[in-house]
């Protein structure tokens, strides 16, 4: 019998390389059975995760899974960093793995750097 616990399917150490100035949707895949849980996004600041209150979010429902989406319209250099989604379900808090956004500032970088270049050319990134 399939578990009816809420599950958040963000892969461990997942990351996205994205460009500032363009939109991006960060998805938190959520699996639940009957009632959809209350899900929030937060951004890691050291050891604490700061809840994102004034940000646009939405749900996308698919047949076997739902996605809680954090909208970046557009991505800003300040959006660089690690994010986590959390679900409140039957008084339990379920936290996802963190997912990291690497933001390239297209106004100061003429080309999008590869992951290898990110380490050697840190001025292209807000890290």
């Amino acid at each position: 019998k399939e578990s009816c616990d809420v599950q958040l399917y963000i892969k461990r150490q997942s990351e996205h390389s994205i460009l500032a100035g363009d939109p991006f949707e960060l998805e938190c895949p959520v699996k639940y059975c009957a009632n959809r849980p209350h899900v929030t996004w937060c951004k890691l600041n050291g050891t604490t995760c700061v809840k994102l209150e004034d940000r646009q979010t939405s749900w996308k429902e698919e047949k076997n899974i739902s996605f809680f989406i954090l909208h970046f319209e557009p991505v800003l250099p300040n959006d660089n960093g690690s994010y986590r989604c959390s679900a409140n379900f039957q008084s339990n808090l379920i936290e996802s793995h963190s997912t990291t956004l690497y933001v390239t500032d297209v106004k100061s970088a003429s080309e999008r750097p590869s992951k290898d270049e990110m380490a050697s050319r840190p001025w292209l990134l807000y890290r």
Epitope: L19, A20, G21, D22, P23, E53, D54, R55, Q56, H71, E73, P74, L76, P77, N78, V106, K107, Y126
Partner: antibody, heavy 120, light 106 residues
Framework: QVQLKESGPGLVAPSQSLSITCTVS????????VHWVRQSPGKGLEWLGV???????SYNPAPMSRLSISKDNSKSQVFLKMNSLQTDDTAMYYC??????????????WGQGTSVTVSS | QIVLSQSPAILSASPGEKVTMTCRAS?????MHWYQQKPGSSPKPWIY???NLASGVPARFSGSGSGTSYSLTISRMEAEDAATYYC?????????FGGGTKLEIK
């Protein structure tokens, strides 16, 4: 220097469609977004939508079904098409450049606007 | 959608007078922009992200606020400040403008 210039038909008959072209100079459409904003006496300033640098679009959900924004990067032009115009679509239509700073996004350079009147 | 309510709708001030206009949002926003518009002209960026003056804007202007309440203040009114000022939020689509405050010189 940064410039945006709108060109439109001026007069449109009710139920017809509107096409406006925004020609930009001083910046690249692959780096900056271009927005469409209209201003009418009845509704004030209303954001219609944006063409993002990478080619995606975002629209105001209210008039979204009637709107289409496209661009030609090589010609530095952004296009607004709006279908099924009614008299309350009479307005000044502006194209506006969008720019980001480290932690905010704003519309900085505005075109002079093109006046559109919907009337038979 | 987030509704921005500006008050007062019309404001009349004498030269040298301190002027404050407000913009209230129906939901919390991260920051507020302000634009100035004079008759026959396009809106001009005036204050970015709550408190950053746009290029060329005199230092007598300032902006403040957070959450749902924001304001634009002129420390000493001058004749060239007569215009309509619009607040604008970029937190949630549709990205809305306030109805404007028309500032007149006495």
């Amino acid at each position: 220097q940064v410039q945006l210039k709108e060109s439109g038909p001026g007069l449109v008959a009710p139920s017809q469609s509107l096409s406006i072209t925004c020609t930009v100079s001083g910046f690249s459409l692959t780096t900056y977004g271009v927005h469409w904003v209209r201003q009418s006496p009845g509704k004030g300033l209303e954001w219609l939508g944006v063409m993002w640098p990478g080619g995606r679009t975002s629209y105001n959900p209210a008039p979204m079904s009637r709107l289409s924004i496209s661009k030609d990067n090589s010609k530095s032009q952004v296009f607004l098409k709006m279908n099924s115009l009614q008299t309350d679509d009479t307005a000044m239509y502006y194209c506006v450049r969008g720019d980001y700073e480290y932690d905010y996004y704003a519309m900085d350079y505005w075109g002079q606007g093109t006046s559109v009147t919907v009337s038979s | 959608q987030i509704v921005l309510s500006q008050s007062p709708a019309i404001l009349s001030a004498s030269p040298g007078e301190k002027v404050t206009m407000t913009c209230r949002a129906s939901s919390s926003v991260s920051y507020m922009h302000w634009y100035q518009q004079k008759p026959g002209s396009s809106p001009k960026p005036w204050i970015y992200a709550t408190s950053n003056l746009a290029s060329g804007v005199p230092a007598r202007f300032s902006g403040s606020g957070s959450g749902t309440s924001y304001s634009l203040t002129i420390s000493r009114m001058e004749a060239e400040d007569a215009a309509t000022y619009y607040c604008h939020q970029w937190s949630s689509n549709p990205y809305t403008f306030g109805g404007g405050t028309k500032l007149e010189i006495k």
